[in-house]
């Protein structure tokens, strides 16, 4: 850069800003206060993001992609604040933004590298495919590509299939694990390194229960303390698998402390719920109640799946009638 008479050029300052898809962010820029303030924000040194001079915005030649999405902190410009408020960032907004600020005595440039991450809450699903059982960890929209790890009984396992579909702005990822015939516990972790956000799914198989017709069964479901934070919103769902698909018996929302019950023979103990114990009772069992029962406790940071297998056998009376 050439030295200029009566003019001070203050070269580049560089910062990294990490934004989340569809959220608002601030691209920071400050300068030494002075008169005749001119502010230009440019993207990749080509596209006009925002211009301010003569005491007001001049957005006539603003690139259309930034229309109605940018503003300055107008009351703070005289104090040396040239930061840009940027609404609803998308993955296409990633890149280098340069803020050029001029006053009567100096010019400064600040570079801001914007990185945008996506992490829609993942899910852990339990599926039957013919005679096989699968656990599937999936995330519908994530960017950049996440790190997915599986553990069996707290030991990392190398088998890690990833089914990935990429769209214009993010990845959709499924990681299935065949757990046929296993009664181990499994854990899947999905990590977005950019957003420093981790989600964990945990699956536990309980010992099978044998019950007689007309009896009741009590099925336990208690969160693992490592993951569970009662202050965080979560949802508990009990469902029963019949012919390969799950039907919901009941669910509980922590935010409203609402319990919705779809099966009249199902009961939940309110006092236990207050102690974060989501065990349930199913009364007056009949033969068609045999099957797999799944308790799903989910929040933004984890999914805890507990599965019980219940075998309902005919009572002696019923057997002797046949």
């Amino acid at each position: 850069i050439f030295p200029l008479a009566f003019f001070i050029y203050v070269p580049m300052n560089e910062q990294i800003v990490i934004g989340r898809l569809d959220e608002d962010i601030i691209l920071p820029s400050s300068f030494e206060r002075g008169s005749e303030v001119v502010i230009h924000w440019k993207y990749q040194d080509s596209y006009k993001v925002h211009s301010y001079y003569k005491g007001s915005d001049h957005l006539e030649s603003q690139d259309p992609r930034y229309a109605n999405r940018t503003s300055l902190f107008y009351n703070e410009i005289q104090n040396g604040n040239a930061s840009l408020f940027f609404r609803r960032v998308s993955l296409l907004d990633e890149g280098i933004y340069t803020c050029y600020v001029g006053t009567a005595i100096q010019v400064i440039t600040n570079k801001v590298v914007l990185k945008v991450g996506v992490f829609l809450t993942p899910v852990m699903k339990y599926e039957k495919r013919n005679t096989n059982s699968f656990l599937i960890c999936s995330v519908l929209s994530v960017y950049p590509r996440p790190i997915i790890t599986w553990k069996m009984d707290n030991t990392p396992i190398s088998e890690n299939n990833m089914e990935e579909t990429g769209s214009l702005d993010s990845f959709s990822i499924n990681s299935p694990l065949n757990i046929t015939g296993s009664n181990s516990s499994y854990e899947c972790t999905i990590e977005n390194s950019l957003l420093k956000q981790t989600w964990t799914g945990r699956w536990t198989m309980k010992d099978g229960l044998h019950k007689m017709q007309s009896e009741h069964v009590s099925l336990s479901c208690q969160p693992v303390n490592d993951y569970f934070s009662p202050n965080q919103d979560f949802k508990v769902t009990w469902s029963r698998m019949k012919s390969g698909t799950f039907s919901v018996l009941a669910y509980y929302l922590s935010s409203s402390q609402n319990t919705i019950i779809n099966e009249s023979r199902f009961s939940w103990n309110k006092e236990l719920i207050n102690q974060s114990d989501f065990s349930m009772n199913l009364m007056d069992l009949n033969l068609s109640d045999s099957g797999e029962y799944l308790c799903n406790i989910s929040s933004d940071e984890y999914t805890l799946l507990t599965i019980h297998t219940v075998h309902v056998e005919p009572s002696q009376e019923t057997a002797s009638h046949n």
Epitope: V38, S46, K48, Y53, Y100, V107, T109
Partner: nanobody, 125 residues
């Protein structure tokens, strides 16, 4: 959009003079700071001079200071670059460019808002 047009380039002997013009038909150049840049074959673009819009402050690169003069004629809606004592190393394509008010983008290296297509200056020895 602002359409800038350079003119006045040509072939000149060492020590000679040329006056380059930068015009913008249908647009008021007084609202803009105008900067001059040049690019020689195989070299990076170099900023050489700029004049602000509000106060007509002028800036020069060391390589041309004392030899080149930038000025503005509001009546003719034109900015001039008077080049004296030309040297072979001044051979390049010369561009004018515009930005609002101050020579902010110019001083930072040239992310100017509007550019002309350039005029060739050749200085022979």
């Amino acid at each position: 959009d602002v359409q800038l047009q350079e003119s006045g380039g040509g072939l000149v002997q060492t020590g000679g003079s040329l006056r380059l013009s930068c015009a913008a038909p249908g647009f008021t150049l007084d609202d803009y700071a105008i900067g001059w840049f040049r690019q020689a074959p195989g070299k990076e673009r170099e900023r050489i001079s700029c004049i602000t819009s509000s106060t007509n402050r002028t800036y020069y690169a060391n390589s041309v200071k004392g030899r080149f003069t930038i000025s503005r004629d509001s009546a003719k809606n034109t900015v001039y670059l008077q080049m004296n004592s030309l040297k072979p190393e001044d051979t390049a394509v010369y561009y004018c460019a515009a930005e609002p008010i101050l020579c902010v983008l110019w001083s930072a290296g040239g992310a100017m808002d509007y550019w002309g297509k350039g005029t060739q200056v050749t200085v022979s020895s």
